[in-house]
């Protein structure tokens, strides 16, 4: 028999950002996707977005970006703009009707555990951990050489010989190298779509800057993608949709897969550098 | 869901008329349209007419100037109005409501609709 799954995650990076994940398991092809919250489709719910297969999408605030992921799966990124988040305790409902075989609905909320897995929320504390290991181990490279060349100066001051330069040892990049592959394990930990490439170059006093340390996105850009060539609602004759409707389910099969958007991810020593990565198999 | 119920549909001789009423549980400000579609045997199945939030009917060209689609929102319910029937308009009628895309009722709900014979 036909199931509906329903997946709510809140953004690692952006803690008022949330996005419900659908997906149809069956045969048979979908004509219409409705998402809604507060309840199920009809019953005390709130429409936030519909979701044709050919024809776009249309969406209600709070939702932000309704898209499809599969010819079966779709995906919508919601935007908590107030201070205390009501999505937290939201039901979330997703509908995927196919036409006249039957409709199907299911209900999620974001789970109240932060446990690793499918249906948990990504934990935003790992990536600030990172963020703070960078800035400790900054502060204290420069701590460090600060008290190492007012020890040179004081060595310096008492010694007959100033001639004697003594020997630059990098302890910028010794530092580096310490925390830039636990940022990025960390990372991947909690990015599970992500491909990270971890190798690093020694860096230079030069180079070494906090804001060549990119944190993990929230969201690629992206244009709306999916099935249908446009997401927005096409402009049609008035009394021509019945010719719409008649090429609507010959081609329903016919939709090929999408490619994931790219992730911009870990840097190496030139700065960021483009990752590949995919939000899942389409 | 909003729970919907067909009837009116029979068989009747060419040039005839049916008249199908659709009732809907709950009218639902949820959806932006409400109105037919139709499946015959071995055929695609197609929009006959819908009627828009603001009331505004459509039809597909094939049945222009033979039927008229109406709504009686005190009663929660919708119907098709099918005057000078053609064998063509033989086929199971479903009463749909649903979302606009352009000029398009996309069904979310759906019953189980009716049959409808026209013989020659």
């Known amino acids: 028999t036909p199931e509906v799954w329903v997946q709510v995650q809140m953004e690692a990076t952006e803690l008022s950002s949330f996005t419900v994940h659908c997906g149809f398991l069956g045969p048979g092809s979908i004509s219409l996707v409705t998402v809604s919250w507060g309840g199920p489709d009809g019953a005390g719910g709130t429409k936030l977005a519909v979701l044709h297969p050919e024809l776009g999408t249309r969406q209600w605030a709070p939702a932000r970006q309704a898209r499809w992921e599969t010819q079966s799966s779709i995906s919508l990124a919601l935007e908590d703009s107030g201070a205390s988040s009501p999505f937290a305790n939201t039901t979330f409902c997703c509908k995927f009707a196919s036409f006249p075989e039957g409709s199907w609905e299911s209900c999620g909320s974001l789970p109240p555990s932060s446990d690793p897995g499918l249906s948990a929320p990504p934990t935003p504390v790992p990536i600030l951990r990172a963020d703070l290991a960078g800035i400790l181990g900054l502060s204290g490279v420069l701590l460090f050489g600060c008290g190492y060349l007012l020890h040179l100066l004081r060595r310096q001051k008492h010694r007959p010989t100033p001639r004697l330069q003594p020997s630059h040892t990098n302890s910028q990049a010794l530092t580096a190298q310490a925390w830039a592959p636990s940022q990025a394990s960390q990372a991947a930990l909690h990015d599970p779509y992500a491909t990270i490439n971890t190798s690093f170059c020694p860096a230079t006093l030069d180079t070494a800057h906090p804001n060549g340390w990119a944190s993990l996105p929230t969201h690629a850009a992206h244009q709306p993608q999916g099935p249908a060539a446009s997401a927005s609602t096409p402009i049609l004759a008035r009394g021509s949709f019945v010719s719409v409707e008649n090429g609507l389910y010959t081609q329903a099969g016919e939709r090929p897969p999408h490619t994931g958007p790219g992730l911009t991810l870990f840097p190496d020593c030139r700065g960021p550098r483009a990752v590949e990565g995919r939000f899942g198999v389409r | 869901q909003v729970q919907l119920v067909e009837s009116g549909g029979g068989s009747v001789q060419a040039g005839g008329s049916l008249r199908l009423s659709c009732a809907a549980s709950?009218?639902?400000?949820?959806?932006?349209?409400m109105g037919w579609f139709r499946q015959a045997p071995g055929k695609e199945r197609e929009g006959v007419a819908h009627i828009d939030s603001d009331g505004i009917p459509r039809y597909v060209e094939s049945v222009k100037g033979r039927f008229t689609i109406s709504q009686d929102h005190a009663k929660n319910t919708l119907y098709l109005q099918m005057n000078s029937l053609k064998p063509e308009d033989s086929a199971t009628y479903y009463c749909v409501v649903g979302f606009k895309f352009g000029d398009y009722c996309a069904p979310n709900d759906w019953g189980q609709g009716t049959q409808v014979t026209v013989s020659s």
């Open positions: 709950r009218y639902t400000s949820r959806t932006d349209c």
